[in-house]
């Protein structure tokens, strides 16, 4: 889980080792702060859980692409 030591900087120290179904993901944000030990992606699920993931993994990239497309699609 993400850890906010000195708010407002949130860092990830461990990544999930399981894929999260894209149907469960609501949004994401990238962690690129130099105050953090590693770059990360934090996914927020539909039940508001936050999960740290490795941006180098393909499933993470696919999930971000999927969420980006969802955001671009206008609601009918």
């Amino acid at each position: 889980q993400p850890d906010a030591i000195n708010a407002p900087v949130t860092c990830c120290y461990n990544f999930t080792n399981r894929k999260i179904s894209v149907q469960r993901l609501a949004s994401y944000r990238r962690i690129t702060s130099s105050k953090c030990p590693k770059e990360a992606v934090i996914f927020k699920t539909i039940v508001a859980k936050e999960i740290c993931a490795d941006p180098k993994q393909k499933w993470v990239q696919d999930s971000m692409d999927h969420l980006d497309k969802q955001t671009q699609t206008p609601k009918t």
Epitope: R18, V22, I51
Partner: antibody, heavy 119, light 113 residues
Framework: QVQLVQSGAEVKKPGASVKVSCKVS????????MHWVRQAPGKGLEWMGG????????IYAQKFQGRVTMTEDTSTHTAYMELSSLRSEDTAVYYC????????????WGQGTLVTVSS | DIVMTQSPDSLAVSLGERATINCKSS????????????LAWYQQKPGQPPKLLIY???TRESGVPDRFSGSGSGTDFTLTISSLQAADVAVYYC?????????FGQGTKLEIK
Amino acid sequence: QVQLVQSGAEVKKPGASVKVSCKVSGYTLTELSMHWVRQAPGKGLEWMGGFDPEDDETIYAQKFQGRVTMTEDTSTHTAYMELSSLRSEDTAVYYCATHDFWSAYFYYWGQGTLVTVSS
Amino acid sequence: DIVMTQSPDSLAVSLGERATINCKSSQSVLYGSNNKSYLAWYQQKPGQPPKLLIYWASTRESGVPDRFSGSGSGTDFTLTISSLQAADVAVYYCQQHYSTPCSFGQGTKLEIK
């Protein structure tokens, strides 16, 4: 395409334990979230538990807490469900079920394993 | 925990007629941001594992005949078979996958009248 192949039928005495296996092919086990669902004769589907990647842990239905253990052997791509202190009401078909990365529903099911508890 | 309740428990319908099964959840399974309800319908025939028919309350799984349709949102859902075929005799279950633990309805047995 995920395939789930379960171990064969078992007959157990009350008080004993049973361990049912579910071998995964087509995906690696760590890419999936394996769940177990049982069905007593003539009854409905009952979720027993499964791996929740959002909490990074195995979650068990309250009814089975302390009596069920779900484990994985990643080297053989096999998931296991062990139920202890068996009683006659545990006679049921036990299914493993999972979904792939693009889904959140149980699209893939094992063929089922009949466990009969009888003295 | 979310409790799923189906009605009726059993249903007898003539071939070619419409069959309607209802499912109610004790809490909403709708995620407002994507306006999707995390509700699935399964069909189970004797001696077989369940088969996914519909997800997100109304999206038909590929290969499922279009006589099957799902509707509803939030807490109230319906599975409709527009023209019953002999192959549709089975038990039907709804399931929520919005929150853990996931839960199934008790099932509705569909028979031919």
